[in-house]
Amino acid sequence: MMTGTIETTGNISAEKGGSIILQCHLSSTTAQVTQVNWEQQDQLLAICNADLGWHISPSFKDRVAPGPGLGLTLQSLTVNDTGEYFCIYHTYPDGTYTGRIFLEVLESSVAEHGARFQIP
């Protein structure tokens, strides 16, 4: 039985040209995390394998950095980065847990006056 829950940073906004940390946290389970996959729509951004460490997909190598922790840092943001991001926790013996984050990348002037979501 899957008892765990994923907490995420939820809906976040950031300025074009800036950077943002995508973070998920799995709680309420003793399952072992064997791998975390980070995805954006139809593309794999990164894999963090418990044995092998981080792999950043070639499409994102220049502007994605691993961490902090199991999170992911997106750099040099563009408006095209707006959209849904998913953290997929592969665990044993529970199976797969998925968290969703929506990122909105705003033009600098808009972001300065718009609502901000702070990362805990």
Epitope: E39, D42, Q43, L44, I47, D51, L52, W54
Partner: antibody
Framework: DVQLQESGPGLVKPSQSLSLTCTVT?????????WNWIRQFPGNKLEWMGY???????RSNPSLKSRISITRDTSKNQFFLQLNSMTAEDTATYYC?????????????WGQGTSVTVSS | DIVMTQSHKFMSTSVGDRVSITCKAS??????VAWYQQKPGQSPKLLIY???YRYTGVPDRFTGSGSGTDFTFTISSVQAEDLAVYYC?????????FGGGTKLEIK
């Protein structure tokens, strides 16, 4: 140039154990790669059996979990496969392979393979 | 386990032809797919990683595409030396699994 070479017996009796060695030259098995065992059954089906990582942690295919052991000798730059309770269904060509983690996340080095027959 | 299905066990083509080999995953694997070529009597060789990236030294007639569950490997102009079995493989999660292979036969 990185090279992998499998060695071990070509014939194993049913219920006995298979022991294979993979000798790696041109690259340290403690650097960045996962060192794998893969087998190819008659008829060409490929099965990933498991790996030992550069740090020494292992992961195996659950279908083989109770029978398989992967170990290494860093001083000789070798890693090993032991498969217990062999049956005719384990007759296959056994390959060792290097799984590149940082850039490709794929098996970019393979040994030439060693044929193993299980028969009394 | 994630099952990778290559629906065609054999494909027959002529030198100079364009040929596409398909692979379907039993569940979502994003772009976590590689393609390998195995020539007769040899071990497999990596051609494509991350669904669409050519490995070092691989001729540009070989391309890969797809995401999610459906993937395609294409040879734009088949050469005689492309006679081989081609395998897809997912690395979305362990156990890493391979397709059953598609044998390319040259007419």
């Amino acid at each position: 140039d990185v090279q992998l070479q499998e060695s071990g017996p070509g014939l194993v009796k049913p219920s006995q154990s298979l022991s294979l060695t993979c000798t790696v030259t041109g690259y340290s098995i403690t650097s960045d790669y996962a060192w794998n065992w893969i087998r190819q059954f008659p008829g060409n089906k490929l099965e990933w059996m498991g790996y030992i990582s550069y740090s020494g942690s292992t992961r195996s295919n659950p279908s083989l979990k109770s029978r398989i052991s992967i170990t290494r000798d860093t001083s000789k730059n070798q890693f090993f496969l032991q498969l217990n309770s062999m049956t005719a269904e384990d007759t296959a060509t056994y390959y060792c392979g290097g799984w590149e983690v940082r850039n490709y996340y794929a098996m970019d080095y393979w040994g030439q393979g060693t044929s193993v027959t299980v028969s009394s | 386990d994630i099952v990778m299905t290559q629906s065609h066990k054999f494909m027959s083509t002529s030198v100079g032809d364009r040929v596409s080999i398909t692979c379907k995953a039993s569940q979502h694997v994003s772009t976590a797919v590689a393609w390998y070529q195995q020539k007769p009597g040899q071990s497999p060789k990596l051609l494509i990683y991350s669904a669409s990236y050519r490995y070092t030294g691989v001729p540009d007639r070989f391309t890969g595409s797809g995401s999610g569950t459906d993937f395609t490997f294409t040879i734009s102009s088949v050469q005689a030396e492309d006679l081989a079995v081609y395998y897809c493989q997912q690395h979305y999660n362990t156990p890493w699994t391979f397709g059953g292979g598609t044998k390319l036969e040259i007419k």
